[in-house]
Amino acid sequence: LKGQEFAPSHQQVYAPLRADGDKPRAHLTVVRQTPTQHFKNQFPALHWEHELGLAFTKNRMNYTNKFLLIPESGDYFIYSQVTFRGMTSECSEIRQAGRPNKPDSITVVITKVTDSYPEPTQLLMGTKSVCEVGSNWFQPIYLGAMFSLQEGDKLMVNVSDISLVDYTKEDKTFFGAFLL
Amino acid sequence: LKGQEFAPSHQQVYAPLRADGDKPRAHLTVVRQTPTQHFKNQFPALHWEHELGLAFTKNRMNYTNKFLLIPESGDYFIYSQVTFRGMTSECSEIRQAGRPNKPDSITVVITKVTDSYPEPTQLLMGTKSVCEVGSNWFQPIYLGAMFSLQEGDKLMVNVSDISLVDYTKEDKTFFGAFLL
Amino acid sequence: LKGQEFAPSHQQVYAPLRADGDKPRAHLTVVRQTPTQHFKNQFPALHWEHELGLAFTKNRMNYTNKFLLIPESGDYFIYSQVTFRGMTSECSEIRQAGRPNKPDSITVVITKVTDSYPEPTQLLMGTKSVCEVGSNWFQPIYLGAMFSLQEGDKLMVNVSDISLVDYTKEDKTFFGAFLL
């Protein structure tokens, strides 16, 4: 009967308990990007700071080569913000020239790569037409949601145009995930 | 051998277990702001409702004088949305007058103050150029991410222009944090 | 004395411990919407995919008839993104006609329905004026925050104009909640 006093707190537990501070977590922050040649319809992936300033990875969540590597299966909350900035969008140039108004756009995609799958899976997308009148424009796209991930899955953030990403401040453009 | 049946659920625990309902949490909602004279390049902080309507603080997470006070060290998810609204932005007035297009902007910053640090740390920033053509414009900026905080840290939300914050509804402008 | 070795990890626990993987969670994704007649000032609710693709419900969190049903009381993080798209907004047509500039708007509301309350409660609202110059425009509104919910509460996502919702991709428009 000795251990019985602990029983009430275990009666509704169907999986092993684990301390919250022991869960895989990461918050990555922006760095200057290397321009990359990418195929049409294939957005380039951002790379990230993982240990300096506000950035960290912990509890076996590792960052390598643009990817966050998921160390254990479970439900994760994944989020990212990308701040874009540019000079007068093509859309307004087109408008001035009296041609049809096909707006520019900015897009962020959080993508999951599973080695056993041939195709990456798009988990989250934020996409916005940009048809600004001012000469300089800037704006963030924020994304966040919960997904069931498997050990070994890899996460990355892709953008429509790497040259428009504001890489100047760690609080403007970031990427993170944590096991729930 | 009596207590042995509970051992498996403790083998992977490296920190004390704790009930989730016992963790510091807060969701604060907008109230009418007091206009403040503020120095150039120093954004004013918003103050918040902490107990009426949807707002609450619990488990030693306290709100005082525009700050959320962090009661224990750990990883927190922090979020805020600020809805801005305005009458025709200066940008469109400048455009009509034929002068150069310097857009207005709206900015939200979630800031951490640590008493032992001389300078506040900007954790999250959402900033957007505003160059609206319509006479009335309104739009939200949302932010959210995870940070490692220390007991005694203080969090606040700063904005570029307090007079543009929509203070009318608790679901439009809010600020929250919870220990993971 | 046998069970004593586990005592330290229980000293700060004031509520039953429970495994994280056992908590109510849902991530719902967009499907094509059925246009609905709705009363003025009453925004239509979206319906959702709950089991195919990225969508899931688990641990007694059920989806039925546009609602997420909360199976147990506690603090939940609730989020949604709705991507809107449209052809030239009325605002720019009005502008061209030289009439006053009343901007169109797009709005997302996450609403809580409690059977014992006569009126639904608006938990989160994202609202944005749309006064686009380009012929096609598209943009997301993201919302997320923590709320104390009661067993039996129901959550839905309402939008200002169901015909403007981008239902084409599960990563563009989604709705989720999880017990903290």
Epitope: - | V31, R32, E49, S163, T168 | -
Partner: antibody, heavy 118, light 109 residues
């Protein structure tokens, strides 16, 4: 079209409590701040206090000890109570809605004349 | 307290005239200033808010300007219905202790 309709006792004796109610018709009650404002005969306007959408009140400091503003959201009504009235409280009392631009009152009740006399 | 001083306290004008009413704050109130019109026996009517923003439904002959401590209300081409009392109101302090000016009575000449 949003309208405010107000009512309450018009004649009070000194030391009594003034009580007025304002009903909101034809529009949303939530999402606005609701104020009481008064105007003594032949004089200017004086803001008394307000209640916000979640029930938080804010009062003119010099009247704070005597004022209570409350709300009944189920009826779309809000009320003013002013205790221990004197002749100086004789005024035309208005309820009003803040348009969301910091104490700019865009919709007003018709006014209720309250006279304090022994 | 922020004191609001309107001038003149009264003025006479004719239909079609352009009139200007000024309002001075005892300290910087940025653009936190509103203007109201009150006709005899009626509730006040909001004309302009945040110094220069025209309230919906108000004729465009009404305009406002100013920032800081000095503000003006201008009525272009006076109409018969414009003869009334006008109040400025500072909305900078929270709560507003002394928010309204003493009024300017606009009379027909």
């Amino acid at each position: 079209q949003v309208q405010l309709q107000q009512w309450g006792a018009g004649l009070l004796k000194p030391s009594e409590t003034l009580s007025l109610t304002c009903a909101v018709y034809g529009g949303s009650f939530s999402g606005y701040y609701w104020s009481w404002i008064r105007q003594p005969p032949g004089k200017g306007l004086e803001w008394i206090g307000e209640i916000n959408p979640v029930g938080r009140t804010n009062y003119k400091p010099s009247l704070k000890s005597r004022v209570t503003i409350s709300v009944d959201t189920s009826k779309n009504q809000f009320s003013l109570k002013l205790s221990s009235v004197t002749a100086a409280d004789t005024a035309l009392y208005y309820c009003a809605r803040d348009n969301g631009w910091h104490y700019a009152f865009d919709i007003w009740g018709q006014g209720t004349m309250v006279t304090v006399s022994s | 307290d922020i004191q609001m001083t309107q001038s003149p306290s009264s003025l006479s004008a004719s239909v079609g005239d352009r009139v200007t009413i000024t309002c001075r704050a005892s300290q910087n109130i940025s653009s936190y200033l509103n203007w109201y019109q009150q006709r005899p026996g009626k509730a006040p009517n909001l004309l302009l808010f945040t110094a220069s923003s025209l309230q919906s439904g108000v004729p465009s002959r009404f305009s406002g300007s100013g920032s800081g401590t000095d503000f003006t209300l201008t009525i272009n081409s006076l109409q018969p219905e414009d003869f009334a009392t006008y109040y400025c109101q500072q909305s900078y302090s929270n709560p507003p202790e002394s928010s309204f000016g003493q009024g300017t009575k606009l009379e027909i000449k």
